[in-house]
Amino acid sequence: ASNFDCCLGYTDRILHPKFIVGFTRQLANEGCDINAIIFHTKKKLSVCANPKQTWVKYIVRLLSKKVKNM
């Protein structure tokens, strides 16, 4: 759920890391209402996820590790 590039809510699905090519952080104090992780998928979709959820943290950690190792 996004509006003018801002997430307004969170997905209720769990995504697999293999589906995700990258992410963007949305911060509530930078013009949007909520904090969010915006996952960019291989199907060119943007998915708004809750940064507090374990599965979201796990994927962010995985992707961050990948970037570090490049």
Partner: antibody, heavy 120, light 107 residues
């Protein structure tokens, strides 16, 4: 060693609710998801939903939305699955299964199953 | 939701045979696929995760392959204990749908 021990068989009347428990041991309970999967007699496996014991986050299959509730008691390392408004088609063996990020989100350990019979 | 179609639904084979079970997803699942074995009256057991990786304690006669929408499970030389029902499962995105199962019977 990892063990998931489920509660015993239940017989329920149509319209009633059932609550099945799954007690985990042998691992750090909050580090893994818990899934619920059911299997009607002679049928295949059907994924019902999952709960993350670390924050009680749940997501359910659309088919069970509004009828299923998964909860967790971290003090006893137990997960519960409650299914309401039971009908005869809900007669099945219900399994809890540990979800493991580390092995490609697979269900690497399963409970022994709980038979729920719905009959008038 | 992603649909998983397994074939064949049943299969008769003999000890020592090489058998292959296939699983087709309704869309690309990028290798996010697991295989389980289930014996009558027992809980399923994880065999293969991530399409190709053997789970702990699973004999090397089992192997998984595939990508995109098409996946397969191969048993290189059937043993008596392998006669069971096999299920594939999509874990790309919830709901985590299963294939309908393949029942492997003794010929």
């Amino acid at each position: 060693q990892v063990q998931l021990v489920q509660s015993g068989a239940e017989v329920k009347k149509p319209g009633a609710s059932v609550k099945v428990s799954c007690k985990a041991s042998g691992y750090t309970f909050t580090n893994y998801w818990m899934h619920w999967v059911r299997q009607a007699p002679g049928q295949g496996l059907e994924w019902m939903g999952v709960i993350d014991p670390s924050d009680s986050y749940t997501t359910y299959a659309q088919k069970f939305q509004g009828r299923v509730t998964m909860t967790v008691d971290t003090s006893t390392s137990t997960v519960y699955m409650e299914l309401s408004s039971l009908r005869s088609e809900d007669t099945a063996v219900y399994y809890c299964a540990r979800g493991n990020y580390g092995v490609d989100y697979a269900m690497d350990y399963w409970g022994q199953g709980t038979l729920v019979t719905v009959s008038s | 939701d992603i649909q998983m179609t397994q074939s064949p639904s049943s299969l008769s084979a003999s000890v020592g045979d090489r058998v292959t079970i296939t699983c087709r997803a309704s869309e690309n699942i990028y290798g996010a696929l697991n295989w389980y074995q289930q014996k009558p009256g027992k809980a399923p057991k994880l065999l293969i995760y991530g399409a190709t990786n053997l789970a702990d304690g699973v004999p090397s006669r089992f192997s998984g392959s595939g990508s995109g929408r098409q996946y397969s499970l191969t048993i290189s030389s059937l043993q008596p204990e392998d006669f069971a029902t096999y299920y594939c499962q999509n874990v790309l995105i919830t709901p985590y749908t299963f294939g309908g199962g393949t029942k492997l019977e003794i010929k």
